[in-house]
């Protein structure tokens, strides 16, 4: 819990440089996100493919989409879970991080120093050990987050199943209902290829309790979809006389000293015929 108050932002006096004053863990160990670069990567053959169970949500069911003032968050059902980690990790929510229309590079994790346009986080909690995500969030092995790197490219109908509801959650505190759909459609190709490390929540209280899985391959959304995400939302309530756009809601990469990120893939890319000389 914060020392005093719970106000935090990505910009201004309550921005990330100040987080650790109220949330000590933000200045502590195992902080996320990080830059994924070759010096810190190590192949681990034991990192087998994850199984995504209960991810195909029925459209007959309603799921709550919320503007929480920091991101747009979709609540997920507790019977949706990951198989293949040491414990069962049940889903609790997904949310996104992004940049702004003039600098559309708002992913949290970077690869070789490069940002992607945006990033999706699917948050799970250890349901073998803990009754809910809130209880699990400050416990060892408590959380597991799947991170999907998003780049600009072709239109993505699956992501639009979220984006098409953004106009109903324009302001902080607003909520809308979204029909269930197959959440696995939000994941990239070849999900067996991923980066794995122990880290933290990327937002206050920055608990160092997250097992991160960052998929190697990005997904694409269109320029129009990205622009909708970057321009649709506000961090402030509808009646706030000083509205603040919800942009650049990503944390800077954190120091990652004397630690390794494990990969489920060997780093050598398969050479193409054109690449041989």
């Amino acid at each position: 819990a914060p020392v005093n108050g719970s106000k935090w932002t990505y910009f201004g006096p309550d921005g990330e440089n100040s987080w650790s004053k109220k949330y000590p863990s933000c200045g502590g160990l195992l902080q996320s996100p990080i830059d994924l670069h070759s010096d810190i990567l190590q192949y681990d053959a034991s990192l087998t493919p994850l199984e995504f169970q209960g991810y195909n949500l029925s459209a007959n069911k309603q799921f709550l989409l919320t503007n929480n003032g920091h991101s747009v968050k979709l609540n997920l059902p507790s019977d949706m879970h990951i198989q293949g980690l040491q414990s069962r990790y049940s889903a609790t929510q997904l949310h996104l991080h992004w940049g702004n229309p003039n600098d559309p590079h708002g992913s949290e994790h970077t690869v070789s120093g490069q940002h992607f346009a945006a990033e999706l986080h699917i948050v799970h909690y250890n349901s073998d050990l803990y009754p809910d995500a809130s209880t699990a969030s400050n416990k060892s092995e408590g959380l597991a987050v799947l991170a999907v790197l998003i780049e600009m490219g072709s239109f993505n109908p699956s992501y639009d199943k979220i984006f098409s509801h953004l106009q109903h959650v324009k302001y902080k505190g607003q909520e809308a209902f979204v029909p269930g759909f197959n959440i696995e459609e939000l994941l990239p190709e070849r999900t067996a290829e991923y980066y794995r490390y122990r880290g933290s929540l990327t937002t206050p209280p920055c608990n160092p309790t997250v097992l991160w899985t960052v998929f190697r391959n990005p997904v694409q959304i269109s320029q129009e979809q990205l622009l909708a995400l970057e321009t649709a939302l506000y961090c402030t309530h509808m009646d706030d006389p000083s509205p603040r756009e919800m942009i650049n809601n990503f944390r800077q990469v954190q120091k990652f000293d004397e630690r390794l990120v494990y990969t489920s893939f060997s780093q050598v890319q398969v050479c193409t015929a054109a690449g041989l000389s």
Epitope: N60, Q62, L64
Partner: antibody, heavy 121, light 106 residues
Framework: EVQLVESGGGLVQPGGSLRLSCAAS????????IYWVRQAPGKGLEWVGY????????TYNQKFKGRATISVDKSKNTAYLQMNSLRAEDTAVYYC??????????????WGQGTLVTVSS | DIQMTQSPSSLSASVGDRVTITCRAS?????MHWYHQKPGKAPKPWIY???SLVSGVPSRFSGSGSGTDFTLTISSLQPEDFATYYC?????????FGQGTKVEIK
């Protein structure tokens, strides 16, 4: 035939609590959420909350958070609404209902017959 | 919360009359749904997705509108149409209903 049947209504003292039941039949119970909607005498309809019978996950109208609890017994195909700290304004017919998806959103295609709760001393 | 205001609250009309009920939302909604309720009975779905009639609803009923303004129209009122009609939105949480329009016999 798809059916929802409510029970458990009656006279309750102010400050008391109620537990209503909604028994479902005629369809695959865990495939649809169950909603509770109430209607005060001569008034409009008001949504209380819903439950996903597959996993017990609940969502409430903020107005009733902390005072209403919805639960489910999958083995009986029955959902329950418990409401505490009742006051006269809670006097209403309480309905359970099932929403169905039609391609964009949902509508309530099946309603129970309703059960009347009267809060009075 | 999105407030739904129906007008009129009640109306008296004769068999054969054309009747229009309006529903205004305090914020834009994607679709509007309408329910029909007889005294002492549960509501019945009547029109969904603004303009689609539920199976079994007579074609004299129609629905239209977009954004914040929606209407239910009965082209030629019949004796069985005397009831209370409620609009409902599902775009935002909490889902909300209008206060109802009671259609009575003149």
């Amino acid at each position: 035939e798809v059916q929802l049947v409510e029970s458990g209504g009656g006279l309750v003292q102010p400050g008391g609590s109620l537990r209503l039941s909604c028994a479902a039949s005629g369809y695959s119970y865990t495939d649809y959420n169950i909603y509770w909607v109430r209607q005060a005498p001569g008034k409009g309809l008001e949504w209380v909350g819903y439950i996903d019978p597959a996993n017990g996950d609940t969502t409430y109208n903020q107005k009733f958070k902390g005072r209403a609890t919805i639960s489910v017994d999958k083995s009986k195909n029955t959902a329950y609404l418990q409401m505490n700290s009742l006051r006269a304004e809670d006097t209403a017919v309480y309905y359970c209902s099932r929403p169905i998806y039609y391609g964009a959103y949902w509508y309530f295609d099946v309603w129970g017959q309703g059960t009347l709760v009267t809060v009075s001393s | 919360d999105i407030q739904m205001t129906q007008s009129p609250s009640s109306l008296s009309a004769s068999v054969g009359d054309r009747v229009t009920i309006t529903c205004r939302a305090s914020s834009s909604v994607t679709y509007m749904h309408w329910y029909h309720q007889k005294p002492g009975k549960a509501p019945k779905p009547w029109i969904y997705a603004t303009s689609s009639l539920v199976s079994g609803v007579p074609s004299r009923f129609s629905g239209s509108g977009s954004g914040t303004d929606f209407t239910l129209t009965i082209s030629s009122l019949q004796p069985e149409d005397f009831a209370t009609y409620y609009c409902q939105q599902w775009s935002s949480n909490p889902l909300t209903f209008g206060q109802g329009t009671k259609v009575e016999i003149k």
